[in-house]
Interface confidence: low
C-alpha cells in the first residue's frame, strides 16, 4: 500500500526510539570509518526531518524514497573522499545505482581497532552518566564491525545489553554479574552476525531462489505440521524481510519482521505447537524466540514419499506444469520427515531430484528412468554422516584446542595462499563445531554440524572475496552454495604451492605473550603453526607436533624466568634453529 511519505510511515510504525536506532545502524554499516559523533549528528537530522513529515506528509522532500533521503544525507559527509576513497564516487550516481554502490563497498573486515572492554566501574559510570549515548555507542560499534548484522536482531541485543548494565551496575559484585553476561552477548553476537552473513551471501551471490529453497527446507523441519501453502507463505514473507535487511533497507525490514511475527502468532494453531511461549513475549524477544524455536513434532502418519515423487505416473506432468512449486513440495515433504538432516543435505537431495527429472522427463520411458532416483540419495546422506562421525571422534580424542590445530594444518595444506589471520580465524571457528555439536545425539548432530560449517565457510568465502589469492577457494565458494563444504572437504594438499621463504622474525616471541589471556596465547601459537606449515607444507603431523610441543615448553619456561625478555631472545634462537633442523628448513 502506497504512502505519501515513506519516512513518515516507517517513523509511525516503528516509533522514535527504534527509528533512530535503525537509522544509526544503517549509517554505521555503510560508513564504517565515520566517528560516532558524526553519525549521531546525521541520525538526529534525519529524525527531525522525519518528524516534520509525520506532521505534514506533503511537506517538501517527504515524498522521497528512503534510499534517496539516506543516500543524500550520507553524501553530505565532508571527508568522504579522504576516508573512503572510491566509495565517494557512489555519490555521483542516481538511485538505485547509488545504494547498490554503497552496498558493494561494505567491508567484511574493516580496518578498525579491536574493541577493548574497559573496567566494570568505568563502564557503569558511563552507563549511568548517559545511558542513551552509551547504548547508541554499542549499536554503532557492532554495526560498523558487522555491516550485515541483522538490524532488528541488533535491537534485541541492545535491549539485553541495557538490561545487563541496569541489573549489574547496582549489584554488590558488579563484575561477577556483568562480565559473564557481556561474554555471552559477545559470543552470541558473533554467531548471529555470521549466520546473517550467510543469508545475505545466499541472496546476493546465488539469488532469491537459493534463499527460498533454504527457507523451505528449514521451515519445513521446524514446522512439520504446517501445510505446504502455509510454509510457502512464510517463506515468501521471510525472503522479503531478509532481502530488505541485506539490501540496507533496515526500516522496512524491521517493520516487516514485526508483521511476520504478528502473523505467525495469530496463526500458530496452523503452524506449530511450540510457539506459545514465544508469542507471549514483547516484540523483540518474540521475533528472536520464533527464529530460534525448536522443531515441532512430526505428524505421526506421514505416508511414503515414493508414492507422489517416484511411483506416480504424473511426476513429469506435475513437474512440467510448475517446476519450482513441485520441487518446493518435494523439499517440504522431505524436510518435514528429516529433522535429522542438515538443510544443505536436503538441498543437495532436491538438486539431485531436479537433475534426474530434467534428464528423465525428456527420455523415452521417464518412469523407468527416474524409478531408482532415491537410491542416488544414499551416498549423499552417508558422506556427511561419516565425516561427522570421524571428526567427532577426533575432537573427543584431542579436545578443542588440539582439534583446531589439526584443522589449521589440514586447511593450510589445502589453501596455503590464504592469509594467516584468516586461516587462524576460520580454522578456530571450524574447530568449535566439536564442542557445539558432538555432544548432541546422532539425530541432532548433522543439522548442527553441517549447517554450522556452512556459516563458517561462508566467512572464509567473504573474507577471501575481498582479496582473492586462491583459485581453489574461489571455485569452492562460487560453484555451488550447498556443495561448499564437500568441495573444501575434497581438497587435497595443494601441490602447486611454492613454500614460503623462512623468516626468523615470524618465529620471534617476546615477554608480552606471558600477559596474554589463554585465548590470545592460543592464537599466537596457532599463528606460528600456520606459518610453519606454509614454510614446510610437506611436514608430517609428528614433526609439527614435536615443534609445537617444543614451542609450548619454550613459552612456559620463559614466562617463568626472572629475565623474561632475555630468555625469549636466547631460547627463541635455539628453538628456531632446532625447528629448522627438525623440519629440514
Amino acid at each position: 500500500d502506497a504512502h505519501k511519505s515513506e519516512v513518515a510511515h516507517r517513523f509511525k510504525d516503528l516509533g522514535e526510539e527504534n527509528f533512530k536506532a535503525l537509522v544509526l545502524i544503517a549509517f554505521a554499516q555503510y560508513l564504517q570509518q565515520c566517528p560516532f559523533e558524526d553519525h549521531v549528528k546525521l541520525v538526529n537530522e534525519v529524525t527531525e526531518f522525519a518528524k516534520t513529515c509525520v506532521a505534514d506528509e506533503s511537506a517538501e522532500n517527504c515524498d522521497k524514497s528512503l534510499h534517496t533521503l539516506f543516500g543524500d544525507k550520507l553524501c553530505t559527509v565532508a571527508t568522504l573522499r579522504e576516508t573512503y576513497g572510491e566509495m565517494a564516487d557512489c555519490c555521483a550516481k542516481q538511485e538505485p545505482e547509488r545504494n547498490e554502490c554503497f552496498l558493494q563497498h561494505k567491508d567484511d573486515n574493516p580496518n578498525l581497532p579491536r574493541l577493548v572492554r574497559p573496567e566494570v566501574d568505568v563502564m557503569c559510570t558511563a552507563f549511568h552518566d548517559n545511558e542513551e549515548t552509551f547504548l547508541k555507542k554499542y549499536l554503532y560499534e557492532i554495526a560498523r564491525r558487522h555491516p550485515y548484522f541483522y538490524a532488528p536482531e541488533l535491537l534485541f541485543f541492545a535491549k539485553r545489553y541495557k538490561a545487563a548494565f541496569t541489573e549489574c551496575c547496582q549489584a554488590a559484585d558488579k563484575a561477577a554479574c556483568l562480565l559473564p553476561k557481556l561474554d555471552e552477548l559477545r559470543d552470541e553476537g558473533k554467531a548471529s552476525s555470521a549466520k546473517q552473513r550467510l543469508k545475505c551471501a545466499s541472496l546476493q551471490k546465488f539469488g532469491e531462489r537459493a534463499f527460498k529453497a533454504w527457507a523451505v527446507a528449514r521451515l519445513s523441519q521446524r514446522f512439520p505440521k504446517a501445510e505446504f501453502a502455509e510454509v510457502s507463505k512464510l517463506v515468501t514473507d521471510l525472503t522479503k524481510v531478509h532481502t530488505e535487511c541485506c539490501h540496507g533497507d533496515l526500516l522496512e525490514c524491521a517493520d516487516d519482521r514485526a508483521d511476520l511475527a504478528k502473523y505467525i502468532c495469530e496463526n500458530q494453531d496452523s503452524i506449530s505447537s511450540k510457539l506459545k511461549e514465544c508469542c507471549e513475549k514483547p516484540l523483540l524477544e518474540k521475533s528472536h524466540c520464533i527464529a530460534e524455536v525448536e522443531n515441532d513434532e512430526m505428524p505421526a502418519d506421514l505416508p511414503s514419499l515414493a508414492a507422489d515423487f517416484v511411483e506416480s505416473k504424473d511426476v513429469c506432468k506435475n513437474y512440467a506444469e510448475a517446476k519450482d512449486v513441485f520441487l518446493g513440495m518435494f523439499l517440504y515433504e522431505y524436510a518435514r520427515r528429516h529433522p535429522d538432516y542438515s538443510v544443505v543435505l536436503l538441498l543437495r537431495l532436491a538438486k539431485t531430484y531436479e537433475t534426474t527429472l530434467e534428464k528423465c522427463c525428456a527420455a523415452a520411458d521417464p518412469h523407468e528412468c527416474y524409478a531408482k532416483v532415491f537410491d542416488e540419495f544414499k551416498p549423499l546422506v552417508e558422506e556427511p554422516q561419516n565425516l561427522i562421525k570421524q571428526n567427532c571422534e577426533l575432537f573427543e580424542q584431542l579436545g578443542e584446542y588440539k582439534f583446531q590445530n589439526a584443522l589449521l594444518v589440514r586447511y593450510t595444506k589445502k589453501v596455503p595462499q590464504v592469509s594467516t589471520p584468516t586461516l587462524v580465524e576460520v580454522s578456530r571457528n571450524l574447530g568449535k563445531v566439536g564442542s557445539k555439536c558432538c555432544k548432541h545425539p546422532e539425530a541432532k548432530r548433522m543439522p548442527c554440524a553441517e549447517d554450522y560449517l556452512s556459516v563458517v565457510l561462508n566467512q572464509l568465502c567473504v573474507l577471501h572475496e575481498k582479496t582473492p589469492v586462491s583459485d581453489r577457494v574461489t571455485k569452492c565458494c562460487t560453484e555451488s552454495l550447498v556443495n561448499r563444504r564437500p568441495c573444501f572437504s575434497a581438497l587435497e594438499v595443494d601441490e602447486t604451492y611454492v613454500p614460503k621463504e623462512f623468516n626468523a622474525e615470524t618465529f620471534t616471541f617476546h615477554a608480552d605473550i606471558c600477559t596474554l589471556s589463554e585465548k590470545e596465547r592460543q592464537i599466537k601459537k596457532q599463528t606460528a603453526l600456520v606459518e610453519l606449515v606454509k614454510h614446510k607444507p610437506k611436514a608430517t603431523k609428528e614433526q609439527l607436533k614435536a615443534v609445537m610441543d617444543d614451542f609450548a615448553a619454550f613459552v612456559e619456561k620463559c614466562c617463568k624466568a626472572d629475565d623474561k625478555e632475555t630468555c625469549f631472545a636466547e631460547e627463541g634462537k635455539k628453538l628456531v634453529a632446532a625447528s629448522q633442523a627438525a623440519l629440514g628448513l
Partner: nanobody, 115 residues
Framework: QVQLQESGGGLVQPGGSLTLSCAAS????????MSWVRQAPGKGPEWVSA????????RYADSVKGRFTISRDNAKKTLYLQMNSLKPEDTAVYYC????????GSQGTQVTVSS
C-alpha cells in the same frame, strides 16, 4: 607467569569447617581485588566471595553469608576462605580468581560435604 594455587579442600561432615588457601605468584598480589568462585558438578561457575586489595571491603553471595569469611595476607601473597557450618550444597571445586571474575584460571581444590 600468573599462578594461583589453591589448597585446603577435603571431605568434611555437614556442620564442619574448612579453611581454603590460595597462594599467588607472578603478579603484584597486593594491588588486586580477589574472589573465590565455586563450581558444583554439572553446574556453571558461581561467585562466592570477594575482597578488595587492602582487605577492608568484603562481599559474599547470599548462599554463604554468615558462614564463610574471606581474608588475605598481602605479605604472604595468600588469599583465604574460612568455611563454617558447611552444608552438602557447598560441595564443589573452589578456586580463586583475580578481580571479580568467574573465569577459572587455576585447578581449584575439591570440597565435599557429606555424612
Amino acid at each position: 607467569q600468573v599462578q594461583l594455587q589453591e589448597s585446603g579442600g577435603g571431605l568434611v561432615q555437614p556442620g564442619g569447617s574448612l579453611t581454603l588457601s590460595c597462594a599467588a605468584s607472578g603478579f603484584t598480589f597486593g594491588s588486586f581485588g580477589m574472589s573465590w568462585v565455586r563450581q558444583a558438578p554439572g553446574k556453571g561457575p558461581e561467585w562466592v566471595s570477594a575482597i578488595d586489595s587492602s582487605g577492608a571491603d568484603t562481599r559474599y553471595a547470599d548462599s554463604v553469608k554468615g558462614r564463610f569469611t574471606i581474608s588475605r595476607d598481602n605479605a604472604k601473597k595468600t588469599l583465604y576462605l574460612q568455611m563454617n557450618s558447611l552444608k552438602p550444597e557447598d560441595t564443589a571445586v573452589y578456586y580463586c580468581t583475580i578481580g571479580r571474575s568467574t573465569s577459572r584460571g587455576s585447578q581449584g581444590t575439591q570440597v565435599t560435604v557429606s555424612s
